[in-house]
Amino acid sequence: NECPELQPPVHGKIEPSQAKYFFKDQVLVSCDTGYKVLKDNVEMDTFQIECLKDGTWSNKIPTCKIVDCRAPGELEHGLITFSTRNNLTTYKSEIKYSCQEPYYKMLNNNTGIYTCSAQGVWMNKVLGRSLPTCLPVCGLPKFSRKLMARIFNGRPAQKGTTPWIAMLSHLNGQPFCGGSLLGSSWIVTAAHCLHQSLDPEDPTLRDSDLLSPSDFKIILGKHWRLRSDENEQHLGVKHTTLHPQYDPNTFENDVALVELLESPVLNAFVMPICLPEGPQQEGAMVIVSGWGKQFLQRFPETLMEIEIPIVDHSTCQKAYAPLKKKVTRDMICAGEKEGGKDACAGDSGGPMVTLNRERGQWYLVGTVSWGDDCGKKDRYGVYSYIHHNKDWIQRVTGVRN
């Protein structure tokens, strides 16, 4: 018994292809690359039909439907543009992922181009089916400093030139320390900012001495100390991590990390600082910023900054030797022999940064830690040296420049 001639589906084929088909002959229907067999609304790779005793086919010929990769996955801090008209998502369609510039940049400078594969998944030549990653751009403020003459005793910072600075504030709005934004969800600050002052008679760190995440908040995009800023973002604290080798008596490894409950929106007034790429050279100029006390023991109205040179380690050690204070390898000193320019109470944890002129990028050198009074002659400001603890910071945060 002969069955009727078969027509292959559009974009498909039948095998074996014969002039005549008889009882018990079987044919396999398959589709071209990028198409799937569709039978009764079910997609499959192939479909088999058989010539029956009564000269009819066991089933109708199915259709071939173009593979659809469907809507591509959303990219955090990124956008999708369709290269094909009508935003097609079918086989061989192309899309391009890009990051929200200028605040995010694609990891490894990936092209971001994905093509809809025959398997129905968006594929990139390098990343395969994995989505690209948009990393925060660090150390490139939208507003650049007017080239400064040397600052004396500090000066008000220009708004937006220090977008990485964070204010650590009690819930009542009272600021108590500074910090710097790293990546999109971490603040680096001084470990001594996260516990109450210790009793000199028994300087051990107890559970009760530590600030709990619910005790304080982080404010980014801040310029005024107490007045509200239109650009400020208030963020809750998820977790705090003090350096495991921190010593509250000597301020050794005086660095801590604060994990934010949610990521801030990066913009012209909120941007992370870059981690140092190498050691800091003695004599290099650095900028220290904060809302700490000024020389008349008054707090400023706005963010202040000073420009000072890095001081040789042995010079700094000698300066503090008479006070029996150790300047260890995890510390870096800055300031001028004659004094007058220094960080002070309330600046703790805040950033000391330097400009890499070749790249035009700002890097974190240190965080404000300790000193003998403020701006004293022959005494330098001592900062926690970020380069020394960069490995630890990267271990905890996963942040890379």
Partner: antibody, heavy 112, light 112 residues
């Protein structure tokens, strides 16, 4: 590498000092832990000495042990050993809180 | 001080199997937890730090994870050489500075 020495049989109350020496890195700029392990028991952290020389002890170890350092050694003094102090004592380099390099240990037996 | 409570010993599994050891911290310590392996007569060896980061040179059959204050060490595709006691260690600085490092009680893994 690190190596401990000075472990021996002592009578209760006789002070004993254990010494840790290092090769391949400088002890003067290292952070060093002392950990002990009683026979058939678990690890017990005793204390740590920082690069600056400051020391921190486990609450149970305060007053019973003293950690000190020279430019080439880190010492652990058991001030007044009791039979409970019988253990293998390890010296281990501290790497941001973890002990990444351990010595083979030295056995201290306290018995009358 | 932070107390670490580990899975009771011994834990037994066949060659080629998988074993998971748990370590419960008495308070939040973030990811400041390490895992060590100690074979009889040897000093401990650091396997994992930061709750889940494998130390360079350690087999990828070892993996660590964290869920709140509960930490896990999983050893897959077990080999006879994995027979050892495994310890977790906290290095989170929140407790009194006396106890800057603490170990769990250890979990012995036996291979059938």
């Amino acid at each position: 590498s690190v190596e401990e020495s000075g472990g021996r049989l002592v009578t209760p109350g006789t002070p004993l000092t254990l010494t840790c020496t290092a090769s391949g890195f400088s002890l003067s700029s290292a952070y060093m832990n002392w950990v002990r392990q009683a026979p058939g028991k678990g690890l017990e952290w005793i204390g740590i000495i920082y690069a600056s020389g400051s020391t921190w002890y486990a609450s149970w170890a305060k007053g019973r042990f003293t950690i000190s350092k020279t430019s080439t050694t880190v010492d652990l003094k058991i001030t007044s050993p009791t039979t409970e102090d019988t253990a293998t004592y390890f010296c281990a380099r501290d790497d941001y809180g973890t002990a990444d390099l351990w010595g083979p240990g030295t056995l201290v037996t306290v018995s009358s | 001080a932070v107390v670490l409570t580990q899975t009771a010993s011994p834990v037994s599994a066949p060659v080629g199997g998988t074993v998971t050891i748990k370590c419960q911290a008495s308070q939040s310590i973030g990811s400041s937890l390490a895992w060590y392996q100690q074979k009889p007569g040897q000093s401990p060896k650091l396997l994992i730090y930061g709750a889940s980061t494998l130390v360079s040179g350690v087999s990828s059959r070892f993996s660590g994870s964290r869920s709140g204050t509960e930490f896990s060490l999983t050893i897959s595709d077990l080999e006879c050489a994995d027979a050892a006691t495994y310890y977790c260690q906290n290095y989170y600085l929140s407790s009194s500075s006396a106890d800057r490092r603490t170990f769990g009680g250890g979990t012995k893994v036996e291979i059938k």
